[in-house]
């Protein structure tokens, strides 16, 4: 029987330009009688184009909603209404092409067509994209708050704030031809729920979204995108009302970077540049396309290539690369944003050299792509370490913590945390290696004790790269580097001359200097410790929620010991600069780690000093007495300590916590406490030092209060940011 | 000092309960785990099971579960340790032992021991 | 439960001897292993816990070493008082278990 042909609306965007027009401030108001007459004449006259082709039968509707520079471009969607069987063959490039080729044929004619009588339109500057209702619809929400700006070579654009009455606003940014708008978003509240979201094309169209921001990011203060031409929206949606604009847009035009280079390594290890998308940190724009070619000096060498927060990964099937596409060797591999480092290892096979193509493969970009490139030795890609084949990166191996997440670097130990003894493979303690006694069979862990010897896990890194073999030598009052550099920066870690956490006492003026209590509004919130003259360690979750993100709020004491009332010895300072781990991670507590910088260098006193920071190497062995201290409740649910609380506690071996706590514990983590409970920080003490005395007298930071199953529970451990799996970070923010 | 001294020893029916009582000295049983361990003659040592004796919290091993009761008296600082449906096999000197308060258990101090004897 | 097996179950030595009791544990206890000496009649005694650590009072002669699942107590210069029953025990997770004991005689 008759069956009824199944029609589907087909929605497209397209800008054409009209040669013989100019484009004028008129033509930016929608309220101005310039722009209603203008939209009247392109209307009909694109209307009158498309019905001019095949395509006419299909016609449905259609709108002229902008205009801009160029001499003057109009920027249109219409609908064709066609039936279901022909919606592939009428894709925007056919649609494209069938419009140019209408035009082009009249360019020269000296009938009179409909569509000409007004405008003299260029085939050249047609443009047809696929969009959608819904695109149509998000547009036309925003019709009511349009704000369409050009941007001239060399200008940077500061755009008004939008309209507060608006629910939703567009701004429509065109640049100079040939060149790309950068347009730069700086949140300037603390909290907000506005959102936006910047687009490749002149409207709101979802498959040409380039990225979108919600509620006053933290991650990320600032911003910066890149479209792939002269053309941009951005649409902002309100959020909770406000009368300050919670960020500030600019725009500018800039050139196209070429994003190609040829690089001789040299013939050395470790890293020996940076390969970076264009205008880094920017995200990348939706066309960039990187072909970088390195040539390695000889084959015993693999290049590296070192990614932070980015990991590479094999895509299954054929589907596209969301966060951009890589060619290395032939092999295509898909980018991914983690919170953690990655490093993609390149065997050499020929002299040739290695290409390496970067390209995003949709509109969708994300933050700019950096990469650390250098070489490694192929036969011995981590002396002293363990290659961990899930990342690339070299860790440490049998230390007691897996490091690699599949846990090979704590399989097949002879000795996991222990010294072994070169005669028998005895496993020593480590503190008994170069203690002046012999403690294996035949001494080896007293042998090269006065001179360097390969790095390895619990070898001591000198400033001069060199290794020495005695495990944690740092301020002990006797140096063991060449360069003296075990015992430089030592002014750490001693306690005052001076004589509750849970089961805890009360500490004594001048017991832990470094003990920083952090305010907001003159009450305790967290714990910290002073590592340096102008810097706090604290827990990144202290600023976990959005209204404790700003500076402004806190106050940093220190030398304090009662909450209630202040003594000569105690200061106070603001904070000029908060930052956070950048791989932190809320629901993880992975990276649980945030610096203050004080607003003023602190003066040292009996009661002000910084504790010493451990080197990577340095082993706080399981069952070590530690002590936390901090003004934490003193019991599950109850008020903040009045007087700072001191306890000690026990370290626990890495892979009993994370049984406990069924594998939640990560190698950036460290666990302590009693199995009586009694005994363990809690609400309060988060962020507050975890610290641990050395041989030497000295008390070096082990570990900050970060998370734990409720307070001094039996069976349940508290557990710890571990500082020796942050210090890198550490020491890049502070030095 | 710390001390923990134990009752004398005690002969059975088999079937029947045996209590043994251990009485600490020299520091606050709230602040410790106590256990009991037990030695068969020539036999190794057995963990049967702890008490908390600040919450009377107990742990025992799974090989006594049902058989052994722990409890503590904070007041005299003793704790006691009685097994039923008493068996040959549970012929033993019977250890109470201090265990350490850190989450790791062994144990520091013990006391005198108390042979128990199971006999028809 | 962790097993933990204890070589040999007695050995004979002398006086100044250098004298090495192994314990194997059934699974890694990282570095969880204590050590105990026991004469006859007596109760048992710590020695040696965390594998390494000495208990307050005990001579430098006792040493602890090992790592994973495979662990040592030596006695560098054996005294007469030495002779005795030693002990080993994991406390890494409950049930806390001990070796099958390794008797020191004298030869």
């Known amino acids: 029987g008759y069956k009824a042909e199944v029609m589907v609306s087909q929605v497209y965007s397209g800008s054409l330009r009209v040669l013989n027009r100019h484009f004028s401030q008129d033509l930016t108001r929608r309220e101005s009688s310039a722009f209603r007459s203008e939209t009247a004449k392109a209307q009909k006259m694109l209307k009158e184009l498309i019905t001019s082709t095949r395509l006419g039968t299909y016609y449905n509707s259609s709108s002229v909603y902008s205009f801009g520079e160029g001499p003057l471009t109009c920027f249109f969607w219409f609908i064709l209404q066609i039936p279901e069987h022909r919606r592939l063959m009428l894709s925007p490039e056919v649609v494209q092409a069938l419009l140019v080729e209408e035009l082009l044929s009249t360019v020269n004619s000296s009938a009179a067509v409909p569509y000409r009588a007004e405008y003299e339109v260029d085939p050249e500057g047609l443009v047809i994209l696929e969009a959608s209702v819904k695109d149509i619809a998000a547009l036309n929400s925003t019709l009511g708050c349009y704000r369409y700006s050009y941007v001239g070579q060399g200008q940077v654009l500061r755009l008004k704030g939008p309209d507060h009455l608006a629910s939703s606003c567009l701004w429509h940014l065109q640049g100079p031809k040939d060149l790309m708008l950068k347009l730069r978003l700086e949140w300037t509240l603390a909290e907000c729920r506005d959102r936006l979201a910047m687009y490749d094309v002149a409207g709101p169209l979802e498959k040409r979204l380039i990225t979108s921001v919600y509620g006053c990011s933290r991650q990320e203060p600032v911003v910066e995108v890149l479209a792939s031409g002269a053309i941009m929206a951005v649409v902002w949606k309100k959020g909770l009302h406000s009368y300050y604009d919670p960020f500030v847009l600019s725009v500018q035009p800039v050139v196209f970077q070429a994003c190609e280079v040829n690089l001789t390594l040299d013939n050395r290890l470790d890293s020996q540049g940076v390969l970076s998308t264009p205008y880094f940190p920017s995200y990348y724009s939706p066309q960039t396309h990187c072909s970088w070619h390195l040539t390695v000096p000889s084959l015993d060498y693999g290049l590296a290539l070192w990614f932070d927060a980015y990991a590479l990964r094999r895509q299954k099937y054929d589907l596209p690369c969301t966060q951009g596409q890589w060619t290395i060797q032939n092999r295509r591999l898909c980018g991914l944003r983690i919170l953690q480092p990655y490093a993609e290892r390149i065997p050499v096979v020929a002299t040739a050299g290695i290409t390496i193509n970067f390209t995003s493969q949709i509109s969708l970009t994300g933050p700019g792509v950096r990469v650390h490139y250098g070489l490694y030795n192929q036969s011995d890609p981590c002396p002293g370490e363990f290659l961990c084949s899930v990342n690339g990166l070299c860790v440490p191996a049998c230390d007691g913590v897996k490091d690699c997440p599949n846990g090979l670097d704590e399989r097949n130990c002879v000795c996991r945390a222990t010294f072994q003894c070169k005669e028998d493979s005895t496993c020593i303690s480590l503190p008994k290696v170069c203690d002046g006694q012999p403690d294996c069979l035949n001494g080896s862990d007293e042998e090269q004790c006065q001179e360097g010897v390969p790095c390895g896990t619990f070898t001591f890194q000198c400033e001069d790269r060199s290794c020495v073999k005695k495990p944690n030598p740092q301020c002990d009052g006797r140096p063991d580097c060449r360069d003296g550099s075990d015992e430089e920066h030592c002014d750490c870690g001693l306690q005052g001359p001076s004589s509750r956490i849970v089961g805890g006492a009360v500490s004594s003026e001048g017991e832990w200097p470094w003990q920083a209590s952090l305010q907001v509004r003159g009450r305790h919130i967290c714990g910290g410790a002073l590592i340096a003259d102008r810097w706090v360690i604290t827990a990144a979750h202290c600023f976990q929620e959005d209204s404790m993100a700003s500076t402004v709020l806190w106050t940093v004491f220190l030398g304090k010991v009662w909450q209630n009332s202040r003594w000569p010895g105690e200061v106070s300072f603001k904070v000029s600069r908060l930052l956070l781990h950048p791989y932190h991670e809320e629901d993880s507590h992975d990276y649980d780690v945030a610096l203050l910088q004080l607003d003023h260098p602190v003066v040292r006193s009996a009661a002000v000093r910084p504790v010493c920071l451990p080197a990577r190497s340095h082993f706080f062995e399981p069952g070590l007495h530690c002590w936390i201290t901090g003004w934490g409740a003193l019991r599950e649910g109850g008020p903040i300590s009045n007087a700072l609380q001191k306890v000690d506690v026990q370290l626990i071996p890495q892979d009993l916590c994370s049984e406990v706590y069924r594998y939640q514990v990560t190698p950036r983590m460290l666990c302590a406490g009693y199995r009586k409970g009694k005994k363990d920080a809690c609400q309060g003490d988060s962020g507050g030092p975890l610290v641990c005395k050395a041989l030497s007298g000295r008390w070096f930071l082990a570990g900050l209060v970060s998370w734990g199953l409720g307070c001094g529970r039996p069976n349940y451990f508290g557990v710890y940011t571990r500082i020796t799996g942050v210090i890198s970070w550490i020491q890049q923010v502070v030095t | 000092e710390v001390q923990l001294v134990q009752s004398g020893a005690e002969v059975k029916k088999p079937g029947a309960s045996v209590k043994v009582s251990c009485k600490a000295s020299?520091?606050?049983?709230?602040?410790?785990?106590i256990h009991w361990v037990r030695q068969a003659t020539g036999q190794g040592l057995e963990w049967m099971g702890r008490?908390?004796?600040?919450?009377?919290?107990?742990e025992y091993a799974p090989k006594f579960q049902g058989r052994v009761t722990i409890t503590a008296d904070t007041s005299t600082d003793t704790a006691y340790m009685e097994l039923s449906s008493l068996r040959s096999e549970d012929t033993a000197v019977y250890y109470c032992?201090?265990?350490?308060?850190?989450?790791?258990?062994?144990?520091?101090?013990w006391g005198q021991g108390t042979l128990v004897t199971v006999s028809s | 439960d962790i097993q933990m097996t204890q070589s040999p179950s007695s050995l004979s030595a002398s006086v100044g001897d250098r004298v090495t009791i192994t314990c194997k544990a059934s699974?890694?206890?990282?570095?969880?292993v204590a050590w105990y000496q026991q004469k006859p009649g007596k109760a048992p005694k710590l020695l040696i816990y965390?594998?390494?650590t000495r208990h307050t009072g005990v001579p430098s002669r006792f040493s602890g070493s090992g790592s994973g699942t495979d662990y040592a107590l030596t006695i560098s210069s054996l005294q007469p008082e030495d002779f005795a029953t030693y002990y080993c025990?994991?406390?890494?997770?409950?049930?806390?278990?001990f070796g099958g004991g390794t008797k020191v005689e004298i030869k």
């Open positions: 032992t201090r265990g350490d308060s850190m989450m790791v258990t062994y144990f520091d101090y």
């Open positions: 020299g520091f606050n049983i709230k602040d410790y785990y």
């Open positions: 008490i908390d004796p600040e919450d009377a919290e107990s």
């Open positions: 699974q890694d206890v990282s570095t969880a």
């Open positions: 965390w594998a390494f």
């Open positions: 025990q994991q406390h890494y997770r409950s049930p806390w278990t």
